[in-house]
Amino acid sequence: EEELQVIQPDKSVLVAAGETATLRCTATSLIPVGPIQWFRGAGPGRELIYNQKEGHFPRVTTVSDLTKRNNMDFSIRIGNITPADAGTYYCVKFRKGSPDDVEFKSGAGTELSVRAKPSAPVVSGPAARATPQHTVSFTCESHGFSPRDITLKWFKNGNELSDFQTNVDPVGESVSYSIHSTAKVVLTREDVHSQVICEVAHVTLQGDPLRGTANLSETIRVPPTLEVTQQPVRAENQVNVTCQVRKFYPQRLQLTWLENGNVSRTETASTVTENKDGTYNWMSWLLVNVSAHRDDVKLTCQVEHDGQPAVSKSHDLKVSAHPKEQGSNTAAENTGSNERNIY
C-alpha cells in the first residue's frame, strides 16, 4: 500500500476579519492509525491550533466527522478570524504513540492572510491655537488594517492638500498595520468654518473610504481689529465714545476702558454678533462727562482676547471744544444706563 500523503490543496487563503476561515486538508490513506493535528507555523515554536484527540478548541470545527472510519478529510474551520490569526497553517498526521503521538507526515502548509479594516481615522490638531498666516500641523492615525497597502489623502474644505508626510508601521511583515500622517495647513482669517479631512482608502473598504475630520474652529484664533470713534454729543456736557471690536474668534474676550490710563470699566463680551465667516463682532461704548475734565482726555479701549496679550486703541477727547458746564464732577459718568452697551 502506498504511503500516506497529507494534501493541503490551498497554498493561500484570504479571509476578512470577523469571518470564518476554511483550511483544507486530506490524507491519501487511513494507515497508520493516529490523529491529525493543525499547527500555525513550523518548528519547535509552532502553535497548536487543533488536536483531534486532546484539548479544547472552541473556535475550531471540523468540516467532516473525523470519527468516521473512512474519513480522510481533515479540513477545519476557524471562526471569528482576527489579524492575529494570520500565518502558515500545517495539517500534520500523527501515528499513535506513547506517551505522545509521533509526528508522521505534514502537509505543505496553507498561508492564511487576514483582510482587516482600518479603524476610523482620528485627526488631531495642535495643542495651542494659532493665528492666520501661521502653518499648523494635523496628525491622522488609523490602526489594525491588513494587508499593508493603504492610501491616505488630506483635504481642506474639499481641496486636496499636498504638504503631508505619511508612515505605515511596522515596515516588515506583521499581522496588522498602522498609518500615521502629518499634514501642514496654512491658516487664513476665513478658516473658522473650515474643516481638515483625512481620508483612508483600503481594499477592505470596497471603495468607500473612511474619513476623520478636525474643525479649524478648534485650532484658529482670529485677533480682533479695534476702532474707537466719538459719537455725536448726546447732551451738551456728554460725549459717547464707542469701541468696535471686529472679526475675532473665539468669543472669549475682555474689554477695559481707560481714561488717561486709569481703569474706568471692564466688561466681558457676552452678546455678540456672528459674521458669515464665523468670526464675531462686539461693540462697547462709554459716556464721558466732559464738564468733569479741565484738560483733554485720552480714552483707551483695551482688549484681551483668548488669554493673549492685550491690544488697545486710543482716542483723544478734546475738552476745550466743549463749553464747561457747572458742576464739580471729576470723573466720567459710568453709572446707570451708561454702563449698558449698545449692540
Partner: antibody, heavy 120, light 107 residues
Framework: QVQLVQSGAEVKKPGASVKVSCKAS????????MHWVRQAPGQRLEWMGY????????KYNEKFKGRVTITRDTSASTAYMELSSLRSEDTAVYYC?????????????WGQGTTVTVSS | DIQMTQSPSSLSASVGDRVTITCKAS??????VAWYQQKPGKAPKLLIY???YRYTGVPSRFSGSGSGTDFTFTISSLQPEDIATYYC?????????FGGGTKVEIK
C-alpha cells in the same frame, strides 16, 4: 501518564451477573474509545465490545449480544462492563483496553485485568 | 467474522536468533493488523499496528510486514526478555479478532 485501573477479582455463581469497572487517567477520557477483551484460560484473546465515551455509542460482538452491557461515567472517567447469565465458560481474565477511534481496533493501553471465576 | 490463523503455536530459539511468526487472515484486511506481546499474568502490550508501524518505545528488533491476507512478525535478534506469547490481531472490521498466539521460548 496513561493508566487504566480495573476493579478486583470476582467469584460468581452461574446465572449471576458481574460488573467490572475500568478507571482511566492521564488522558481525556472522552477522546478515546474503551474496549473490553477477555481471555479464558489457555484461549486466545476475545473482543467483547466497545463504548465511545464521547457520544455513548456502543458496539458488541454478536457472540455476547444480549448478555453484555458496556456503560460509562464520564465525570468519573470510568467505563463498566456487565456480563449477565454467567456460565462456567465465562471464567476468564477481563481486560479494558483503549483505542483511538471506534473504527480502530489496535489497543495501545490495557488495564491490568480482572479475574472473573464462575463456579457453583 | 474474520479468522486469524497464527503459526507456529510455539517455537524455541536461541538468543540472537531471528524469529519469524506468520499470520493469515481469512479475508483481505489491507494492512490493518496489530501484533501484541503478552507475558504470563500480564496484559498484552502493543508492539506493531497497521501491519508495519512500530509503537513508540518498542525496540527496533521487532518488525512487521504484509498486506491483504498474509502477515509476518519478526524478532531480528532474540533477547532473553522477549520470552512471551505473541498474538496477531486484525483491526480491519468488527468483531476484532486475534490469532491463537505463538509462545516463544529460549533454547
Amino acid at each position: 501518564q496513561v493508566q487504566l485501573v480495573q476493579s478486583g477479582a470476582e467469584v460468581k455463581k452461574p446465572g449471576a451477573s458481574v460488573k467490572v469497572s475500568c478507571k482511566a487517567s492521564g488522558y481525556t477520557f472522552t477522546s478515546y474509545v474503551m474496549h473490553w477483551v477477555r481471555q479464558a484460560p489457555g484461549q486466545r484473546l476475545e473482543w467483547m465490545g466497545y463504548i465511545n465515551p464521547y457520544n455513548d455509542g456502543t458496539k458488541y460482538n454478536e457472540k455476547f449480544k444480549g448478555r453484555v452491557t458496556i456503560t460509562r461515567d464520564t465525570s468519573a472517567s470510568t467505563a463498566y462492563m456487565e456480563l449477565s447469565s454467567l456460565r462456567s465458560e465465562d471464567t476468564a481474565v477481563y481486560y479494558c483496553a483503549r483505542s483511538y477511534y471506534d473504527y480502530d481496533g489496535s489497543f495501545d493501553y490495557w488495564g491490568q485485568g480482572t479475574t472473573v471465576t464462575v463456579s457453583s | 467474522d474474520i479468522q486469524m490463523t497464527q503459526s507456529p503455536s510455539s517455537l524455541s530459539a536461541s538468543v540472537g536468533d531471528r524469529v519469524t511468526i506468520t499470520c493469515k487472515a481469512s479475508q483481505d484486511v489491507t494492512t490493518a493488523v496489530a501484533w501484541y506481546q503478552q507475558k504470563p499474568g500480564k496484559a498484552p502490550k502493543l508492539l506493531i499496528y497497521s501491519a508495519s508501524y512500530r509503537y513508540t518505545g518498542v525496540p527496533s528488533r521487532f518488525s512487521g510486514s504484509g498486506s491483504g491476507t498474509d502477515f509476518t512478525f519478526t524478532i531480528s535478534s532474540l533477547q532473553p526478555e522477549d520470552i512471551a506469547t505473541y498474538y496477531c490481531q486484525q483491526h480491519y472490521s468488527t468483531p476484532w479478532t486475534f490469532g491463537g498466539g505463538t509462545k516463544v521460548e529460549i533454547k
